[in-house]
Interface confidence: low
């Protein structure tokens, strides 16, 4: 962009420029190549020799300008046109300036000449005119721009100089160079002047615009010489919750029902199924009621909600274990975490309340967390009826603040042989034989029909076992080894089979000599 | 918490050249811009230059253009070389960190690597 | 280069007295687009390295005593230590965080009677 500080084809009175001497420069009403009048200045002592002929335009302000541009349009006329012309005609000036911190000139000062002036350059006309175009009105105007800088006082002056030429200066125009306000890359670069070189960049730090923040290196953009922006180093995206419009002038808080998480340059996003904004500007949707986000949900998937219960349960009893199965829940909530536990209720015989069954009760593979729809329950009671929930469950299940769906299913055990007998001992030993008593089991799950206990010499393999059977909890063993010792298991038989065996008991048979001992205390005194 | 551990002191001739890292750790590494800036003995603050360990971009004080190289490794670390050395440049270096976003100043500072140049 | 000129140089006080130091730039230090003041305030104690104080021309980094406050804009600042103590004995700079190269100002040294 170019700001001009002076054009003399504004003039709408005489422009009343500085000439010296008199006789040089005179301003005269003139045309531009439109025809329009304008004031010009026009020289042409070409018959006189030795001319040094100074125009000094009025005092220049800078306005900030680090350098400056001089647009001039001239005619020079052909010296090889005139006759008789000296060998001193000329088809050139000099372009000069001087600085100055206000308007300070008089007829005398600055002095005419060189320096104090500085010279900018010699002046060449690309096309002279003859005779012949004055004539015809066709008049072949040119066209100079020269720069120069830097300049730091308030203001300067123009200086043309002639030096035995016949021209006339039709238009000057006086500018600076400027890159103007602008919006790229998400942020704002004020207008910024160009610099004091033609090859200077002057660097302009830019400041993103409203809702954007920085992303990378600070935001800076080059203003060339010919007022020209560069390729900008960084830039600013719209922050969460805003989107670029308007080429990326304007970062638009995110429309009702679309929403943008993070900062970046894509646009904003409609809210997922499920889900809405109560603002714009959002950053995020919220879940419709009944609709829930998991922690590690991202915020671009649709809100979810609990499942359903499962369906079509089938229950399989054997005596004391079970076999459940059913089949997934019809709505899985949308989601695809689905897991399955297990509510385990022991109701007694049938009447009075259901408590939670114990710790005994084994599930294979799992209680809790399962993935298969099925399950094996085992270490249940005989004849004991039970209540199993089997819940749906989801990664939104712990947000809701409904308890989980379920499936229910009452089963009732069947007869079970007894449980192992706990605790065995011994009540009496001989030499050669061993009588043992234990308790009934915990657990008879019926009426016991009688015991049956398997021994064998602990010296020996378990394989050389002998069983033997008693319909009380009592036995004497009998054909024992003196002093040896066996190892005793007993298991308890109803009309559903046996139980297991308790766990191994060791007994010792006495030694000749405990029994010799034992008979002399017992013998009278 | 966020720390800067940098190299020991570093003695070396002129027209030598040392290279002198800064260790981070405690925060993302990448969401903040590492500076560099000396400090001669009883004088002010000189700031060198920055790189963003994210991209590798570098910009460098002027002076320093032709004196200083900065580089990161993905380990966390930043590395500042100083070529042809003279006795000017015998100074206290340190690191700091300005965060990339929002807000304007350098918050943590390393303890400093002193560089002595002498024949 | 924006230049930053601090002054006093150097100022003793005596403990529970307010200390005022300035700080002027060259060239304004805000920021028209989002009206910061690109300005900060550092404290470096004898054979430390610097610690931030103040960013943004006058919010107080967290940690840092409230008797530590900052005002000023476009290219006058002051920083304000209402009521010195013992351990604020340091030099104190600020520095140019609005234009490349960063500068900072020559410091002002607080020394205590």
């Known amino acids: 962009v170019e700001e001009t500080l002076m054009d003399s084809t504004t003039a709408t009175a005489e422009l009343g420029w500085m000439v010296h001497p008199p006789s040089g420069w005179e301003e005269v009403s003139g045309y531009d190549e439109n025809m329009n009048t304008i004031r010009t200045y026009q020289v042409c002592n070409v018959f006189e020799s030795s001319q040094n002929n100074w125009l000094r335009t009025k005092f220049i302000r800078r306005r900030g300008a680090h350098r400056i541009h001089v647009e001039m349009k001239f005619s020079v006329r052909d010296c090889s046109s005139i006759p008789s012309v000296p060998g001193s005609c000329k088809e050139t000036f000099n372009l000069y300036y001087y600085e100055a911190d206000f308007d300070l000139a008089t007829k005398t000062f600055p002095n005419w000449m060189e320096n104090p002036w500085v010279k900018v350059d010699t002046i060449a006309a690309d096309e002279s005119f003859s005779q012949v175009d004055l004539g015809g009105r066709v008049m072949k105007i040119n066209t100079e721009v020269r720069s120069f800088g830097p300049v730091s006082r308030n203001g300067f002056y123009l200086a043309f100089q002639d030096y035995g030429g016949c021209m006339s200066l039709i238009a000057v125009r006086v500018f600076y160079r400027k890159c103007p306000r602008i919006i790229q890359n998400g942020a704002i670069f004020q207008e910024t002047l160009s610099g004091a070189e033609s090859t200077s960049l002057v660097a302009a730090r830019g400041s993103c615009i409203a809702n954007a923040e920085e992303v990378d290196v600070p935001i800076k953009l080059y203003c060339n010489g010919d007022g020209e922006w560069l390729v900008p180093i960084g830039r600013c995206m719209c922050k969460a919750g805003f989107e670029a419009v308007e080429n990326g002038t304007v970062c638009r808080g995110c429309p009702s029902g679309t929403f943008k998480a993070n900062q970046g340059d894509e646009a904003c996003t409609h809210c997922p199924i499920n889900s809405r904004t109560t603002s714009e500007g959002a950053t995020n949707c919220v879940c419709r009621n009944g609709y829930y986000r998991a922690d590690l949900d991202p915020l671009d998937m649709p809100c979810t909600t609990i499942p359903s219960a499962p369906q079509a349960v089938i229950s399989s009893v054997n005596e004391t274990s079970l076999m459940l199965e059913w089949t997934p829940p019809r709505d899985s909530g949308g989601r695809e975490d689905l897991v399955y536990n297990i509510i385990c209720k022991s109701c007694g015989s049938g009447r009075g309340a259901c408590t939670r069954c114990g710790d005994n009760v084994q599930y294979a593979p799992r209680q809790l967390g399962l993935t298969e729809p099925r399950i094996y329950i085992s270490d249940l009671l005989a004849h004991t009826q039970y209540t199993f929930e089997i819940q749906a469950v989801n990664g939104v299940t712990d947000q809701s603040p409904f308890s989980p769906q379920f499936a229910s299913v009452n089963i009732t055990t069947n007869q079970a042989a007894p449980s192992a007998v706990s605790i065995m001992h011994q009540v009496s030993r001989t030499v050669d034989s061993i009588t043992l008593s234990w308790s009934q089991p915990d657990q008879p799950n019926g009426v016991i029909l009688d015991y049956e206990l398997q021994y064998y010499e602990k010296e020996l393999s378990e394989y050389n076992a002998t069983a033997i059977k008693s319909p009380t909890n009592t036995v004497t063993v009998q054909g024992l080894k003196a002093g040896a010792i066996y190892v005793f298991q007993v298991r308890a038989r109803t009309v559903a089979g046996y139980g297991r065996y308790s766990g191994k008991m060791y007994f010792q048979t006495m030694t000749e000599a405990e029994y010799q001992t034992s008979i002399k205390e017992k013998l009278p005194l | 918490q966020v720390q800067l551990q940098q190299s020991g002191a570093e003695l070396a001739k002129p027209g030598a050249s040392v290279k002198m890292s800064c260790k981070a750790s405690?925060?993302?590494?990448?969401?903040?811009?590492m500076h560099w800036v000396k400090q001669r003995p009883g004088q002010g603050l000189e700031w060198i230059g920055f790189?963003?360990?994210?991209?590798?971009?570098t910009d460098y004080n002027q002076k320093f253009k032709d004196k200083a190289t900065l580089t990161v490794k993905s380990s966390n670390t930043a590395y500042m070389q100083l070529s042809r050395l003279t006795s000017e440049d015998s100074a206290v270096y340190y690191c700091?960190?300005?965060?990339?976003?929002?807000?304007?100043?350098?918050?943590?500072w390393g303890q400093g690597t002193t560089l002595t140049v002498s024949a | 280069d924006i230049v930053m000129t601090q002054s006093p140089s150097s100022l003793s006080v005596s403990a529970g007295e307010k200390v005022t130091m300035n700080c002027k730039s060259s060239?304004?230090?805000?920021?028209?687009?989002?009206?910061?003041?690109?300005l900060a305030w550092y404290q470096q104690k004898p054979g430390q390295p610097p610690k931030l104080l103040i960013y943004?021309?006058?919010t107080r980094e967290s940690g840092v005593p409230d008797r530590f406050t900052g005002s000023g804009s476009g290219t006058d600042f002051t920083l304000t230590i209402s009521s010195v103590q013992a351990e604020d004995l340091a030099v104190y700079y600020c520095?140019?965080?609005?234009?490349?190269?960063?500068?900072f100002g020559a410091g002002t040294k607080v020394e205590i009677k």
């Open positions: 790189i963003n360990p994210s991209t590798g971009y």
């Open positions: 700091t960190r300005r965060l990339k976003l929002l807000r304007y100043a350098m918050d943590y």
């Open positions: 405690g925060y993302t590494f990448t969401s903040y811009w």
């Open positions: 520095q140019n965080d609005h234009s490349y190269p960063f500068t």
């Open positions: 943004g021309a006058s």
């Open positions: 060239q304004s230090l805000l920021n028209s687009g989002n009206q910061e003041n690109y």
